[in-house]
């Protein structure tokens, strides 16, 4: 192996005839927590202007919608689907669309989605055709 070859491409190397291919990281909306006007809609845009390269190639895009007495927020991040987020398992992490699912949380309405397509957490779906409940 030539001395210039990068080492330690670890679990993101896929075995193949050419000696392995390297999985690239996902591109996700990444504005952390922002105030949102998304309410009583079947779907919303994130209105997040930052698309980040996820830190690790196995991370997926996540969106978290929260409503309480004071405000509505939308959180957009990258996250490892093997790890919980806000205490919840990332369901549908391989999905191409970010379809919101309600989670039980005291004192607020809490929806979360995960998906694995470029910038898929920019468009979040609450629609009845995808899920049994929608916010308010």
């Amino acid at each position: 192996i030539p001395p210039h070859v990068p080492k330690s491409v670890n679990s993101d190397v896929m075995a193949s005839d050419n000696g392995g291919a390297v999985k690239l990281p996902q591109l996700c909306k990444f504005c952390d927590v922002r105030l949102s006007t998304c309410d009583n809609q079947k779907s919303c845009m994130s209105n997040c202007s930052i698309t980040a390269i996820c830190e690790k190639p196995h991370e997926v895009c996540v969106a978290v919608w929260r409503k309480n007495d004071k405000n509505i927020t939308l959180e957009t991040v990258c996250h490892d689907p093997k790890l919980t987020y806000h205490g919840f398992t990332l369901e549908d992490a391989a999905s191409p669309k970010c379809v919101m699912k309600e989670k039980k949380r005291a004192g607020e309405t809490f929806f979360m989605c995960a998906c694995n397509m470029e910038e898929c957490n920019d468009y979040i779906i609450f629609s009845e055709e995808y899920t049994t409940s929608s916010p308010d």
Epitope: V5, V9, G19, A21, V22, K23, L27
Partner: nanobody, 124 residues
Amino acid sequence: EVQLLESGGGLVQPGGSLRLSCTASGFTFTEYRMWWVRQAPGKGLEWVSLIEPIGNRTYYANSVRGRFTISRDNSKNTLYLQMNSLRAEDTAVYYCAKQIPGHMWTANPRSDYWGQGTQVTVSS
């Protein structure tokens, strides 16, 4: 022969700047998304920045956002990385790599999809 050749690395003090270049040959440069990837001593690969082949839309890792700027000159088959406000943690070998069109994969780092790398050392 397909080739990616990086240049512009060196030793710089914290807070300083460097501009890396990656000259491509042997393939149609405008067909490929291009990445800057770095590897710090004893660490894995870190995907620093990406630029689209046409339209020049750019993406960054959060660790470099606001400090690094990726660009490309398709007429010169050259990719650039302008690095400002450099920190000790930016010390690494920097590689340019091309993405397999239509896939979220690149070929293995020993292939001609990767350059040979240029060393950037940030130290006082």
